[in-house]
């Protein structure tokens, strides 16, 4: 008789997710020398201990601090990069501006960076058929409750001047409920923190409004001011020219507003 | 098995550039880090650059930071190197390597190496 | 940059004899350190990685010693099919860089 297998909204386990978590450990290691004391076979059992047999809506960051442990990186403090639903252009501007670092630049993040897992209470099955969903299910899910722990620890660490690409396309530029709203705002520390710098990427070829003055940015400036960081906002109009400009500075057209 | 097998030689003008391919077979192309080597006719081995062709990142050797460019087809499973404003000192073998994860960061598979010509 | 520097460039030796070549780096590597077998018209063979550990179907006539900046390859007894250049390679940061080579001979 097949066992009765709980069904949820969200889509299951990435395919090969032990293997490509494994993968990633080592490519890290490799591409980052300083991380090569990293035992990969242990953050992998450290990652899987996080999930495995324990019921999917009931993960705690608890849960996820052994891999923590093992996953510790020094990144400098005040060249973080934090970003809200513009991922792709966030890493494309720390792969030229390599000083620079996104939560995904880091080891945990760049291990889980768009994978989905979880697994079943009491059996030690990954369940490739489906995942709780953050919303229509329920909130401490694997991911979701791995994303918020990493993220608070990231935005725990920065210091001085923390710059954040927003998505000037979108209705809501500034989302209280996204990662960066809910979590990384609230955790960035003012007695490191100087200021926070917004960037607001334009998306029409002709949008040359002034984005820094949308509600939702105004409403990130007052959660900031209050907890006594200073903002600050630019808006980039032009991002391709603003890659380019990061990339090859000294040429002529990069005086200009971007 | 693993095999990583790159594109016929080439023999190109002073100035212009060229493309070599690496395809990757045996194995999941995203997995591995592709490095990318050459050597000039009696010459020593020079790194150039690596891919991680599950993202696209790159990083290359300082002496070729403006001239080159690896890019990766992950559909094809194949790895590119580009080299532009090529002059006689480009003249090399060009090969493809990669690392077995098992053998520290070695190069443990190597492509069967592409020879570049530059005349003027 | 990492330099390496190989001793001797050039090694005459006979099949049967016991020979070893040296690998200097300019700062410490620790055992970040791979060799190769090289012969004419083909692509680098691993034989050493981590500084002392036999790549896979390696004979184990071949060996790796050393740590920081000082590493020894030996061949403790030379075979026919040896004779071929051979190249030091550190792993330990980028850009990852080569010894300049041994071009070992038949006496």
């Known amino acids: 008789v097949p066992r009765w297998r709980q069904q949820w909204s969200g889509p299951g386990t990435t395919k090969r997710f032990p293997e490509t978590v494994l993968a990633r450990c080592v490519k890290y290691t490799e591409i980052h020398p300083e991380m090569r004391h990293v035992d990969c076979q242990s953050v992998w059992d450290a990652f899987k201990g996080a999930f495995i047999s324990k019921h999917p809506c009931n993960i705690t960051e608890e849960d996820y601090q052994p891999l923590m442990k093992l996953g510790t990186q020094t990144v400098p403090c005040n060249k973080i990069l934090l970003w809200s639903r513009i991922k792709d252009l966030a890493h494309q501007f720390t792969q030229v501006q390599r000083d620079m670092f996104t939560l995904e630049d880091t080891l945990l993040g760049y291990l889980a960076d768009d994978l989905t897992w979880c697994g079943e209470f009491n059996t030690s099955k990954i369940n490739y058929q489906s995942c709780p969903d953050w919303r229509k299910d329920c909130s401490n899910n694997p991911v979701s409750v791995f994303w918020k722990t990493v993220s608070r620890r990231f935005a725990e660490a920065a210091c001085d001047v923390v710059h954040v690409m927003l998505n000037g396309s979108r209705s809501k530029i500034f989302d209280k409920n996204s990662t960066f709203g809910s979590v990384e705002v609230h955790n960035l520390q003012p007695e490191k923190v100087q200021t926070l710098e917004a960037w607001v990427i334009h998306g029409g070829r002709e949008d040359s409004r002034d984005l820094c003055q949308d509600p939702t940015i105004k409403e990130l400036e007052s959660i900031i001011s209050k907890r006594n960081i200073q903002f600050s906002c630019k808006n980039i109009y032009r991002p391709d020219k603003f890659l380019q400009c990061v990339k090859n500075p000294e040429d002529s057209s990069c005086t200009s507003e971007i | 098995q693993m095999q990583l097998v790159q594109s016929g030689a080439e023999v190109k003008k002073t100035g212009s550039s060229v493309k070599v391919s690496c395809k990757a077979s045996?194995?999941?192309?995203?997995?591995?880090?592709m490095h990318w080597v050459r050597q000039a006719p009696g010459q020593a081995l020079e790194w150039m650059g690596w891919?991680?062709?599950?993202?696209?990142?790159?990083d290359y050797a300082q002496k070729f930071q403006d001239r080159v460019t690896i890019t990766a087809d992950r559909s094809m499973s194949t790895a590119y190197m580009e080299l532009s404003s090529l002059r006689s000192e480009d003249t090399a073998m060009y090969y493809c390597?990669?690392?077995?994860?098992?053998?520290?960061?070695?190069?443990?598979?190597w492509g069967q190496g592409t020879l570049v010509t530059v005349s003027s | 940059d990492i330099q390496l520097t190989q001793s001797p460039s050039f090694l005459s030796a006979s099949v049967g004899d016991r020979v070893t070549i040296t690998c200097r780096a300019s700062?410490?590597?620790?055992?970040?350190l791979a060799w190769y077998q090289q012969k004419p018209g083909k692509a680098p063979k691993l034989l050493i990685y981590?500084?002392?550990s036999l790549a896979d179907g390696v004979p184990s006539r071949f060996s790796g010693s050393g740590s920081g900046t000082e590493f020894t390859l030996t061949i403790s007894s030379l075979q026919p099919e040896d004779f071929a250049t051979y190249y030091c390679q550190q792993y330990n940061n980028y850009p990852y860089t080569f010894g300049q080579g041994t071009k070992l001979e038949i006496k």
């Open positions: 700062e410490d590597i620790y055992s970040n």
């Open positions: 981590d500084a002392n």
């Open positions: 390597a990669r690392s077995a994860h098992t053998t520290g960061f070695g190069f443990a598979y």
């Open positions: 045996g194995y999941t192309f995203t997995d591995y880090i």
């Open positions: 891919i991680d062709p599950e993202y696209g990142r790159t």
